[in-house]
Amino acid sequence: WELTILHTNDVHSRLEQTSEDSSKCVNASRCMGGVARLFTKVQQIRRAEPNVLLLDAGDQYQGTIWFTVYKGAEVAHFMNALRYDAMALGNHEFDNGVEGLIEPLLKEAKFPILSANIKAKGPLASQISGLYLPYKVLPVGDEVVGIVGYTSKETPFLSNPGTNLVFEDEITALQPEVDKLKTLNVNKIIALGHSGFEMDKLIAQKVRGVDVVVGGHSNTFLYTGNPPSKEVPAGKYPFIVTSDDGRKVPVVQAYAFGKYLGYLKIEFDERGNVISSHGNPILLNSSIPEDPSIKADINKWRIKLDNYSTQELGKTIVYLDGSSQSCRFRECNMGNLICDAMINNNLRHTDEMFWNHVSMCILNGGGIRSPIDERNNGTITWENLAAVLPFGGTFDLVQLKGSTLKKAFEHSVHRYGQSTGEFLQVGGIHVVYDLSRKPGDRVVKLDVLCTKCRVPSYDPLKMDEVYKVILPNFLANGGDGFQMIKDELLRHDSGDQDINVVSTYISKMKVIYPAVEGRIK
């Protein structure tokens, strides 16, 4: 019996087609992805093949103005229109709190939303009961397939799930649910979840009875053969893991941003064992037409976005200096504003010993593309912020050793004076450079804001200590020559859309007046 699994993950509000790098579509003839194009391909496969499941492994939320404006209603609407069969909860589904998940998505979705390792307690338990499930048994043809969900247990550090959701260890939580499915005579089981490729592989290895793992969170691109676009495969598709009980378990992920549709064909025997698995992600390029009815619906929903772009978010009473003449040479107040917003967006009081889990921010000056003039009645709009941060990136959480941070700050000024983009703006960091010294030895003082303290203060950076840092995904991926970050990072979790972080902060503050205050000397 053959099952076709179509899967997406980490779509991050890319409802409209995008450019090849998943930023805003400029030249439509070269654009990719989007729900209208996805629907065309899904329908084509549904017509051609008998047993098809369309699954999403989480993080539909967060990433473009679509989410900022519609707050998840767009996810429910278009996933319903595409007739998804199931979705796993990702960390970003909690970005607007539990209410921001329940009302727009859980109550509106016509498909099951799953996570076995999230347990509700207190008053939330009855409110959320039945709105998400640990597993769902789906009829497919004359067979049944069990889908068990899982979500990164790091979610409390990455999003805003509140205090009434407990995120358990994935493997510990999944095993009893899989066992329950087995007792219900469900012998074909897919683990669908959002904890990253390393955890996906561990689940395949450790959870007895899981036949296939469909993952997300790490934006992993797998491919067999010659890849069709710029993404470099982390391994073959599917990636085969040998389980502890001797089975070959296929593990898949489909990169991110709706650029690809994962396509996996699984052959099951009569006992539910996987006999064979093969496939590849399908690049959703312009050779696949956009479905006209979905496209028309997108255009209808788009109207509200254009109006939102020009509405006032808040005011500035100072010039926001985002000029390259400032931000690539010295501390600039636009850099300070953005870093303050980045830290504010990551306030999570999860431990009494820590005022916050992260206190530090770094930001490449070259990523700041425009100033904002206060002489326009001080008004700041989304449109203004899009000029400052035009690349559609995210502000991510990483863990780095102190020694890596020291290398990063040396790189920041290794060719100082040439107006290059690698000059770092900071938050929660005091750095002193001596530019008379030779490159690679210019950082003379590097103090960082403590986290395990009730009164935050600056202490010297320790080379062997592991620090959490918020930074643009561009830097996490080694951009602007920061190869040491990419090579030496110990953990990387993708965060919220850059403009959204800053716009939320400005809306919260109402009036802003960031200063140049001696963070960089």
Partner: antibody, heavy 113, light 106 residues
Framework: EVTLKESGPVLVKPTETLTLTCTVS????????IQWVRQPPGKLLEWLGV???????DYNAAFISRLTISKDTSKSQVVLTMTNMDPVDTATYYC???????WGQGTLVTVSS | DIQMTQSPSSLSASVGDRVTITCRAS??????LNWLQQKPGGAIKRLIY???SLDSGVPSRFSGSGSGTEYTLTISSLQPEDFATYYC????????FGGGTKVEIK
């Protein structure tokens, strides 16, 4: 639980027709095929034929003229019919799942007058 | 038709011994190979499917490997209950079996 059980006569006279039934439980014949295999005493396993989930059948070329495999999906039963039986057809007859994950216990059919 | 050549046809071994049985296909069968165990009573049980995946409840001392046309069943430490006849079965085309390997007590 996934099980297969063969049933039918233990003794068949030469030139007669053998009819064996394989009753399936734990899976659907609309999703999976059933294979038939036999093993003469002290000899090797020999594949006879298969009926697929869609209802079509394939046969070992050596038996194509006298073998028919059919099914009744609603009863979860597959029927093997072999005409013109001969003493050399004495064997244990097995039905098995399409992929060989499950086997019946086998039924010994003796062809003798 | 695809022919399967299995060797050895029989072997004598002691409890604790490592036993290896091989099967050669007349053409590439792309990992579509099972290993079956038949006990003296006639009951047939699949041990390994798709070349190397272990069936549920089968001890981990059994393992399978191979690709293309060459396939191997290994019993890492023979136990008393392992004395039986073993067959390879290819299902890339119409089923064909190897000639069997009878594992006897030395």
């Amino acid at each position: 639980e996934v099980t297969l059980k063969e049933s039918g006569p233990v003794l068949v006279k030469p030139t007669e027709t053998l009819t064996l039934t394989c009753t399936v439980s734990g899976f659907s014949l609309s999703s999976y095929g059933i294979q038939w295999v036999r093993q003469p005493p002290g000899k090797l396993l020999e594949w006879l034929g298969v009926i697929w989930s869609g209802g079509s059948a394939d046969y070992n070329a050596a038996f194509i003229s006298r073998l028919t495999i059919s099914k009744d999906t609603s009863k979860s039963q597959v029927v093997l019919t072999m005409t013109n039986m001969d003493p050399v057809d004495t064997a244990t007859y097995y039905c098995a799942g399409q992929y060989g994950s499950v086997w019946g216990q086998g039924t010994l059919v003796t062809v003798s007058s | 038709d695809i022919q399967m050549t299995q060797s050895p046809s029989s072997l004598s071994a002691s409890v604790g011994d490592r036993v290896t049985i091989t099967c050669r296909a007349s053409q590439d069968i792309g990992d579509r190979l099972n290993w079956l165990q038949q006990k003296p009573g006639g009951a047939i049980k699949r041990l390994i499917y798709a070349t190397s995946s272990l069936d549920s409840g089968v001890p981990s001392r059994f393992s399978g490997s191979g690709s293309g046309t060459e396939y191997t069943l290994t019993i890492s430490s023979l136990q008393p209950e392992d004395f039986a006849t073993y067959y390879c079965l290819q299902y890339a085309g119409s089923w064909t079996f190897g000639g069997g390997t009878k594992v006897e007590i030395k």
